[in-house]
């Protein structure tokens, strides 16, 4: 640790005195102290000497000697008082800048330690301190306002009692800055803009911050726009607003607009796109396939995306048949706005009934005309099967009718014994009918197919089963021949045919 001569913590001298402060260390040493006049600095081997032959009140302060090469950073200090009866204060600063809630040190250094008992801090022109101002005093350093607040940004003076009268220091301006959490907050309105050529448009870029020191600008396709700025202060925030007004837009006004604000913490920017069109437009689309297939009893949401400018003047969902003249219930139609020019319209069809298959159309209208988008909804059904015994051209024939959607496939099984359903162990013969006859196939209806199995002689201790299946499910019908006729077994029930 360096050593200072004279080896006293404080030195009190009169104005005009010669003061010599010598610092000696193991290596090179360096003096640090307040910016003040009249000092001469010179080196003498491993010591550094600070001297003045005309000390003034301005030399009052703490002088510290350090060894720059010392990794432990040891230092020694001496405080010099130059007690001038006419100048009780040496003020080291015109201005002190701190952030809110920091301690603010107002560097009024007392030039005579004897005066410490009668010191006080006041605002300029003798005004008292603001309420709740918590401060302390150190003769070496000055007054400290603890946890300074923005409202305490004032001009202050230090006061000392000398011979019964108060002597003031020159003033110190305290600037308490708000803590800036980050770059200014930004808004750019609208987020997107579409106009027809010749219409008026307005784009508003605004930025706000707790501190007034920030810049904001609006740029179009990387060109900074010269727009007058409006400033305001409310809700404890400074606001700067740039408003671009275009009376008659043209294609050159289209493009990307960016609102950019910056302060000491950094920069924020937000962008929007301005589209200029020749005329009104209305576009309907769907991410769904326009041809929909849903199993009966299930639900479906039909969604249409609408892009339009100007806004819609009307819209509705319509059922175009073929089953009934019912119309979708309004409560099942839902509209959501994605943004100003894009909307999604949804029709909810819960627990679909057979009569609800068919065409659903969404119609929309704006000044550009009207558009429609139509969905075709077909319901899927599991096959329903029935078998009858008949004679065709004199031959005994089993006739199987299967009805469902999609079109069912048909398989015949012959098995031993009398049973509701053939299982693998009983199966004697299997016939696939790759091309059953289509009896009916209308849009939005079930497909009915018919399969014929010609049987020369019915075996009486056997069962004939017609099975039909599609992507939804399967159905079957068991036919049991008996001497007096035949038994037929639909699934899960018993029928007797005389």
């Amino acid at each position: 640790i360096p050593v200072i001569e004279p080896s006293v913590p404080e030195l009190v001298v009169k104005p005009g005195a010669t003061v010599t402060l010598r610092c000696v260390g193991n290596g090179s040493v360096e003096w640090d102290g307040p910016p003040s006049p009249h000092w001469t600095l010179y080196s003498d081997g491993s010591s550094s000497i600070l001297s003045t032959n005309n000390a003034t009140f301005q030399n009052t302060g703490t002088y510290r000697c350090t060894e720059p090469g010392d990794p432990l950073g040891g230092s020694a200090a001496i405080h010099l008082y130059v007690k001038d009866p006419a100048r009780p204060w040496n003020v080291l600063a015109q201005e002190v800048v701190v952030f809110e809630d920091q301690d603010a040190l107002l560097p009024c250094l007392l030039t005579d330690p004897v005066l410490e008992a009668g010191v006080s801090l006041v605002r300029v022109r003798g005004r008292p301190l603001m309420r709740h101002t918590n401060y302390s005093f150190s003769p070496w350093h000055g007054f400290t306002i603890h946890r300074a607040k923005f409202i305490q940004s004032q001009d202050y003076q230090c006061s000392a009692l000398m011979g019964g009268r108060k002597v003031m220091s020159i003033s110190i301006r305290l600037k308490v800055q708000k803590v800036i959490p980050g770059p200014p907050a930004l808004t750019l309105v609208p987020a997107e803009l579409v106009r027809i050529r010749g219409e008026a448009a307005q784009i508003v870029c605004s930025a706000s911050s707790v501190d007034v020191n920030f810049d904001v600008f609006l740029q179009h396709n990387n060109t900074k726009l010269a727009i007058p700025q409006q400033s305001d202060f409310h809700n404890n925030r400074y606001q700067k607003v740039l408003t671009l007004n275009l009376d008659q837009v043209d294609f050159q006004h289209a493009g990307n607009y960016s609102c950019v604000a910056s302060n000491v913490q950094g920069k924020h920017s937000t962008s929007m796109f301005f589209r200029v069109v020749e005329s009104a437009y209305l576009n309907l689309s769907s991410e769904q396939n326009l041809i929909q297939e849903v199993t009966v009893g299930e639900g479906l949401n039909l969604k249409v995306m609408v892009e339009a400018y100007p806004g819609l003047q009307g819209f509705n969902w319509t059922y175009l048949g073929p089953f009934s003249d019912h119309q979708p219930e309004p409560k099942l139609a839902n509209a959501t706005t994605k943004d100003t020019y894009r909307h999604t319209f949804t029709l909810s069809l819960p627990r679909l009934k057979p009569s609800e298959a068919g065409r659903y159309s969404f119609l929309a209208r704006n000044p550009g005309g009207w558009r429609a988008l139509t969905f075709e909804l077909t319901l899927r059904y599991p096959p329903e099967v029935s078998v009858i015994w008949t004679f065709i051209n004199g031959s005994g024939t089993l006739l199987c009718a299967a009805s469902g959607y999609p079109q069912p496939n048909v398989t015949w099984l012959q098995c031993s014994g009398h049973t509701d359903r053939c299982d693998e162990a009983q199966v004697l013969q299997v016939w696939d009918d790759p091309y059953p006859e289509v009896l009916s196939q209308e849009p939005f209806h079930k497909v009915t197919v018919q399969s014929l199995l010609t049987v020369e002689t019915l075996e009486h201790n056997q069962t004939y089963e017609c099975r039909a299946h599609n992507s939804v499910g399967s159905g079957s019908w068991a036919f049991i021949p008996i001497s007096a006729g035949a038994h037929t077994h639909p699934p899960d029930e018993f029928l007797f045919t005389p």
Epitope: W31, P35, S36, W39, L41, L50, A93, V97, A104, L105
Partner: antibody, heavy 117, light 110 residues
């Protein structure tokens, strides 16, 4: 070894605020005092102001109304803000360290700021 | 207009001795020490002389400073081509409570 480095935009528009930062290494800005000096192209040096510990600042009378210094001891940085700039503020801006008896013993390399629209 | 006054230019041939003057007033040079700075083309100023006549380590002893009353001077002996630079004097000013500079002297080595 004490080193100072100025940073900030090289171009500022008239009437806007010039902002520069000086980053110090090899010394603590809690010690000594720290100045900004400028030099217009082809001209001499002009002292702008200095700050001494805890945000205490003194400014050149000719610039006082437009200057603000701020300090970030955690980053060992100090900053200059000069408001309402004109073409006359075009200069190379230097930051420098000072100590008792020597107003400027270490300097940054300087940064040119041009004021133009 | 600079507070301290310096001649705008000075010149000399290699090996010669050149002196640059700096004059001020009682509030600056008269009551405070003088510092000299050398600024090579395109670089930052560098401390050359402090406290009237003290040289920082690394500065050749060809450079010396002196002060008398309200004036100071910088002497460069054994002039070398690398000494071609701008030279500035500076001093604390009591009335300003801050440092002041001279206008600078451009030294040309012929």
């Amino acid at each position: 070894q004490v080193q100072l480095q100025e940073s900030g935009p090289g171009l500022v528009k008239p009437s806007e605020t010039l902002s520069l930062t000086c980053t110090v290494s090899g010394a603590s800005i809690s010690s000594y005092y720290w100045s900004w000096i400028r030099q217009p192209p082809g001209k001499g040096l002009e002292w702008i102001g200095y700050f001494y510990y805890s945000g205490s600042t003194n400014y050149s009378p000719s610039l006082k109304s437009r200057v603000t210094f701020s300090v970030d001891t955690s980053k060992n940085q100090f900053s200059l803000k000069l408001s309402s700039v004109t073409a006359a503020d075009t200069a190379v801006y230097f930051c420098a360290r000072g100590k008792v008896g020597v107003p400027f013993d270490y300097w940054g390399q300087g940064t040119l700021v041009t004021v133009s629209s | 207009q600079s507070v301290l006054t310096q001649p705008p230019s000075a010149s000399g041939t290699p090996g010669q001795r050149v002196t640059i003057s700096c004059s001020g007033s009682s509030s600056n040079i008269g009551s405070n020490t003088v510092n000299w700075y050398q600024q090579l083309p395109g670089t930052a100023p560098k401390l050359l002389i402090y406290s009237n006549n003290q040289r920082p380590s690394g500065v050749p002893d060809r450079f010396s400073g002196s002060k008398s009353g309200t004036s100071a001077s910088l002497a460069i002996s054994g002039l070398q081509s690398e000494d071609e630079a701008d030279y500035y004097c500076a001093a604390w000013d009591d009335s300003l409570n801050g440092p002041v500079f001279g206008g600078g002297t451009k030294l040309t080595v012929l």
